[in-house]
Interface confidence: medium
């Protein structure tokens, strides 16, 4: 039994520039149940926010509804994988809604 492997945010999509969704690939689970959470901050802010909607985009996803989506901001996000043995973090991903399709 091991801590989880490093997850990877591999795709973000914004079909209408009003909402967007990002998906991650889990790393190895270490042989234990693993919880995933996506956190993000915006521009130069230090305040961290948790994913507002883990449901809409399906498994291993975070959906940002209209009220959370701004074409004026860069989102810096990462995924945390946690099991009883420890945690691991994805690399940070910088997302500008204007430039994702």
């Amino acid at each position: 039994q091991l801590p989880p492997g490093k997850p990877e945010i591999f795709k973000c999509r914004s079909p209408n520039k009003e909402t967007f969704t990002c998906w991650w690939r889990p790393g190895t689970d270490g042989g234990l149940p693993t919880n995933y959470s996506l956190t993000y901050h915006r521009e130069g802010e230090t305040l961290m926010h948790e994913c507002p909607d883990y449901i809409t985009g399906g498994p291993n996803s975070c959906h940002f509804g209209k009220q959370y989506t701004s074409m004026w901001r860069t989102y810096i996000m990462m995924v945390n994988a946690t099991n009883q043995m420890g945690s691991s973090f994805s690399d940070e991903l910088y997302v500008d809604v204007t430039y994702i399709v």
Epitope: G44, G65, W72
Partner: antibody, heavy 115, light 111 residues
């Protein structure tokens, strides 16, 4: 320490032009969208314009569309507002503000449009 | 006419609690956009007081608090002090204007 310093205000005749500058220091300017907000004498705050972190997107309040142009030079850490066809109702103190929430503001520069 | 509606004035005595309201519409506050509050002391530039409805930037006393519900928001100041005498503005993003909108401002007088 975050600092925003506006300049370029002054007295101009109706129909004239001015270019305002906002020099930024103490933070990574290119990470932030920037606003211009104005305040007419004795009145409240009025949002004027917004530019994205990379300069690729801009937005304006209706009353200045086609007359004002917001721009930025990230290599110089400077925000600009080019104001053409100025009207008496554009008379105000013009502030630049950092980020979508306006967490830091400059001290303002006064623009007076009068004949 | 401001897009967000605030009372033009409010007042209280030292130590009191005062509340300032900010009413918007379905294209701004009611669309789920965060409300921010700014304090403008006489002769100075505005300063961010509350952001994202209820969060205080570092250095802002916990006497200041914000809340939001539906198409309205409010700013509460408890333990009122003479140095709180200022103009207070709410602001939010507006979908239909694709920009910021402000309230008309509330002049707070400490009696």
């Amino acid at each position: 320490e975050v600092q925003l310093l506006e300049s370029g205000g002054g007295l101009v005749q109706p129909g004239g032009s001015l270019r305002l500058s906002c020099a930024a220091s103490g933070f990574t300017f290119s990470n932030y969208g920037m606003h211009w907000v104005r305040q007419a004498p004795g009145k409240g705050l009025e949002w004027v314009s917004l530019i994205s972190w990379d300069g690729g997107r801009t937005s304006y309040t209706d009353s200045v569309k086609g007359r004002f142009t917001i721009s930025r030079d990230n290599s110089k850490n400077t925000l600009y507002l080019q104001m053409n066809s100025l009207r008496a109702e554009d008379t105000a103190v013009y502030y630049c503000a950092r980020g979508l929430i306006g967490d830091n503001w400059g001290q303002g520069t006064l623009v007076t449009v009068s004949s | 006419q401001s897009v967000l509606t605030q009372p033009p004035s409010a007042s209280g005595t030292p130590g009191q609690r005062v509340t300032i309201s900010c009413t918007g519409s379905s294209s701004n506050i009611g669309a789920g956009y965060d409300v921010h509050w700014y304090q403008q002391l006489p002769g100075t530039a505005p300063k961010l007081l509350i952001y994202d409805n209820n969060k205080r930037p570092s250095g802002v006393p916990d006497r200041f608090s914000g809340s939001k519900s539906g198409t309205s928001a409010s700013l509460a100041i408890s333990g009122l002090r003479s140095e709180d005498e200022a103009d207070y503005y709410c602001a939010a993003w507006d979908d239909s204007l694709n920009g910021w909108v402000f309230g008309g401002g509330t002049k707070l007088t400490v009696l």
